[in-house]
């Protein structure tokens, strides 16, 4: 049994780190492999992650962690039974992928404005809470070429756009993702998308 692509891990900088790797051939990850992880600290335990399949030769493990701090470092050991396949380390603070924003809602009750709101995925005591900026993707359900990205570089998780910038009588979808500038993170996954109907009509004299 051989590791083809070594484990790479990303942390949500809260409680979960996700590690993925590829094996040299088809593998039943949960039956054959174990990923052991331990915080480099004298009295910490070695926890065991039972991986799950991620495609024919891919495996994924979710490591459960304490609230992460910048100096935390974990040792990782990938085992197949009593055979050590790979040994490595992982510093969560250096490989952050934020959680996806949630509760994306579209408010269209203001006549000429579409208001999008969403929730910051972190509690206020988390370091990332005040460091997130967002990208909002809005697209026309019937015309994928009619798609745009709005960068939200302020802290408030809201976006206002004039309804007039969208085609009238068309269904649109929106989704949002986040990243944290000061932690040099990757982008989060996109939030689930939300659909709405743009019923805005231009005033009669402008037609």
């Amino acid at each position: 049994m051989k590791v083809l692509q070594e484990p790479t891990c990303v942390s949500d900088y809260m409680s979960i780190s996700t590690c993925e790797w590829k094996m040299g051939g088809p593998t039943n990850c949960s039956a054959e492999l174990r990923l052991l992880y331990q915080l480099v600290f004298q009295s910490s335990e070695t926890h065991t992650c039972v991986p799950e399949n991620n495609g024919g030769v891919g495996c994924v493990c979710h490591l459960l962690m304490d609230d992460v701090v910048s100096m935390d470092n974990y040792t990782l050991d990938l085992w197949a039974g009593q055979q050590l396949l790979w040994k490595g380390s992982f510093k969560p603070s250096e490989h952050v992928k934020p959680r996806a924003p949630g509760n994306l809602t579209v408010h269209t009750n203001v006549s000429d404005t579409v208001l999008l709101t969403w929730s910051n995925p972190y509690p206020p005591d988390n370091y990332l809470y005040n460091d997130l900026t967002y990208a909002v993707n809005i697209w026309n359900e019937n015309d994928l070429a009619d798609s745009r990205i709005h960068n939200v570089t302020y802290l408030k998780p809201t976006l206002r756009i004039p309804a007039s910038t969208l085609k009238s009588g068309i269904s649109y979808r929106a989704r949002v993702r986040a990243w944290a500038q000061h932690y040099n993170t990757t982008w989060s996954e996109w939030s689930p998308s939300t659909k709405w109907y743009n019923s805005y009509r231009e005033p009669f004299e402008q037609r």
Partner: antibody, heavy 129, light 109 residues
């Protein structure tokens, strides 16, 4: 210093109840591990009672003999784990240890306790009339 | 719940002896087995976890082996401070239960 300190032991009459406490210091009792209770009757071996996951999910596991009479709970704000014991019998007389445990997880919701790494000094419970 | 059968229940040995204690699980527990040392009036001390991994600060004369159902604790050269009671602890995947063996008391011959 990382340590666990049990309290609440003492003499209790048969049929009575008692709540033991385990105060954690040097680490957060809400972090990713299990907090467990183990007991040892005088001159006998070690007996696992149960565990509670100290992270956000708070799942519990109990030995089959302990289900119903024994309940483990936690108060993360006080960094404390509790063992509530009801309908006590003479055979429950033992030293009760609190222990921190490693875990095995599959995904983020299937987590179970593994070995006990850090132990308290124990508190003696005597059930007698 | 699983059962853990530990043997012998007691043994007498001299300083310098090689000592072996075995533990058998009633079902396959992979490598989810730990060994503890306990001295009178004290809490147990972790020696080995995952069947063969030495815990922090434990002398290298202690070693563990086995997987599945059969496990062994070996003390390669018994020292005066090793006279104590030893317990195995098996952890069951299927039920989430943890069961101790009955213990082995190592006494001075």
């Amino acid at each position: 210093e990382v340590q666990l300190v049990e309290s609440g032991g003492g003499l209790v009459q048969p049929g009575g109840s008692l709540r033991l406490s385990c105060a954690a210091s040097g680490f957060s009792s809400s972090s990713a591990h299990y907090m467990c209770w183990v007991r040892q009757a005088p001159g006998k071996g070690l007996e696992w009672i149960g565990c509670i996951y100290a992270g956000s999910r708070g799942s519990t596991y109990y030995a089959s003999w302990a289900k119903g009479r024994f309940t483990i709970s936690r108060d993360n704000s006080k960094n404390t784990v509790y063992l509530q014991m009801n309908s006590l019998r003479a055979e429950d007389t033992a030293v009760y240890y609190c222990a921190r445990a490693a875990f095995v997880n599959r995904g983020v919701s299937w987590i179970w306790p593994y070995y006990f790494s850090l132990w308290g000094q124990g508190t003696l419970v005597t059930v007698s009339s | 719940d699983i059962q853990m059968t530990q043997s012998p229940s007691s043994l007498s040995a001299r300083v310098g002896d090689r000592v072996t204690i075995t533990c058998q699980a009633s079902e396959d527990i992979e490598s989810y087995l730990a060994w503890y040392q306990q001295k009178p009036g004290k809490a147990p001390k972790l020696l080995i976890y995952r069947a063969s991994t030495l815990a922090y600060g434990v002398p290298s004369r202690f070693s563990g082996s086995g997987s599945g159902r059969d496990f062994t604790l070996t003390i390669s050269s018994l020292q005066p401070e090793d006279f104590a009671t030893y317990y195995c602890l098996g952890s069951s995947y299927s039920t989430g239960s943890n069961i101790f063996g009955q213990g082995t008391k190592v006494e001075i011959k």
